[in-house]
């Protein structure tokens, strides 16, 4: 059974994700971004379920993609290069998701645009947090 | 001084369309980007739709999208909103908005004093 | 799109007394390149918004120092610090860090 310290550590993972998520959203998702309009152009594919930590399989499979389109963006919308972002972001997924166990992610028919795939996944980690605390 | 003045607010009958203009002076005009944002009678203010410095990007809010268009003219300082197909709900003072982005970003920091659009029967 | 809820609705202040306003998004608004685009806005009755703050705290020019925010992320405050019969009007949030979005109002009056 999971302890309140393991509970306590997972649920500031996932905040760190959170912020993490929201912070890329925030630098894509806005009027004075100047490559908005290409961005939106990508395609990303969104997990047909998303409700257990194990699901996060289906996002660290879409990091590389989602590196390549944040490298589209100035330099100044980023404070930190995509490349550092990404691999925050798949250390706290490897960290959440455990590596003991293989998940095959399943996707959806449809695919998404990043800012839909950005809040899908903001979505998910809202709804983990909630239910521990 | 820095001044925004709309004009080219009245009343009109749903579904129809009307335009309207702010002339902006006492700055470089070419080098903001530009909002329009509104507020209905009582309420709040709402953002509707921004433009960028060289007219290469505009937005919209949801609620006019499809509706509602964007434009300037650097040359003359002019910035417009064509209205489309409008509705009782667009009933509203529309205020333009200056706002920097690329060197020191404040915000929407100079506004009009607005206009009054009246969609009604 | 992020929501900004303001809090309270209505403030009825004494003249010379404090008056706080506060704002929380629904999202955390830290742009990545690190600045977090949270404005305050002053509409006295009959006049256009007028900016008061920007980038959380910073005085806009012209802007009375009785007026500060604060705050980070999620949560910021803007603080009269001795209310004046000139700052009766409606106070707004505004957040740029996406796409543009106001809180409600917070209408500060003179008991």
């Known amino acids: 059974a999971p302890t309140s310290s393991s509970t306590k550590k997972t649920q500031l993972q996932l905040e760190h994700l959170l912020l993490d998520l929201q912070m890329i959203l925030n630098g894509i998702n806005n009027y004075k971004n100047p490559k908005l309009t290409r961005m939106l152009t990508f395609k990303f594919y969104m997990p047909k379920k998303a409700t257990e930590l194990k699901h996060l399989q289906c996002l660290e499979e879409e990091l590389k993609p989602l590196e390549e389109v944040l490298n589209l963006a100035q330099s100044k919308n980023f404070h930190l290069r995509p490349r550092d972002l990404i691999s925050n972001i798949n250390v706290i997924v490897l960290e959440l998701k455990g590596s003991e166990t293989t998940f095959m992610c399943e996707y959806a028919d449809e695919t998404a645009t990043i800012v839909e795939f950005l809040n899908r996944w903001i979505t998910f980690c809202q709804s983990i947090i909630s239910t521990l605390t | 001084q820095v001044q925004l003045v709309e004009s080219g607010g009245g009343v009109v009958q749903p579904g129809r369309s009307l335009r309207l203009s702010c002339a902006a002076s006492?700055?470089?005009?070419?080098?903001?980007?530009m909002h329009w944002v509104r507020q209905a009678p009582g309420k709040g203010l709402e953002w509707v739709t921004v433009?960028?410095?060289?007219?290469?990007?505009?937005y919209y809010a949801d609620s006019v999208k499809g509706r509602f268009t964007i434009s300037r003219d650097n040359s003359k300082n002019t910035l417009y909103l064509q209205m489309n197909s409008l509705r009782a709900e667009d009933t509203a003072v529309y205020y333009c908005a200056r706002e920097e982005w690329e060197l020191e970003d404040y915000g929407m920091d100079v506004w009009g004093q607005g206009t009054t659009v009246t969609v009604s029967s | 799109d992020i929501v900004m809820t303001q809090t309270p609705l209505s403030s009825p202040v004494t003249l010379g007394q404090p008056a706080s306003i506060s704002c929380r998004s629904s999202?955390?608004?830290?742009?990545?390149?690190?600045?977090?685009?949270l404005s305050w806005l002053q509409q006295r009755p009959g006049q256009p918004p007028r900016l008061l703050i920007y980038k959380i705290s910073n005085r806009f020019s012209g802007v009375p120092d009785r007026f500060s925010g604060s705050g980070a992320g999620t949560d910021f405050t803007l603080k009269i610090s001795r209310v004046e019969a000139e700052d009766v009007g409606v106070y707004y949030c505004?957040?740029?860090?996406?796409?543009?979005?106001f809180g409600q109002g917070t209408k500060v009056e003179i008991k």
């Open positions: 433009i960028w410095y060289d007219g290469s990007n505009e």
């Open positions: 006492g700055f470089t005009f070419s080098i903001y980007g």
């Open positions: 505004m957040q740029t860090t996406q796409f543009p979005t």
């Open positions: 999202q955390s608004l830290v742009h990545s390149d690190g600045n977090t685009y």
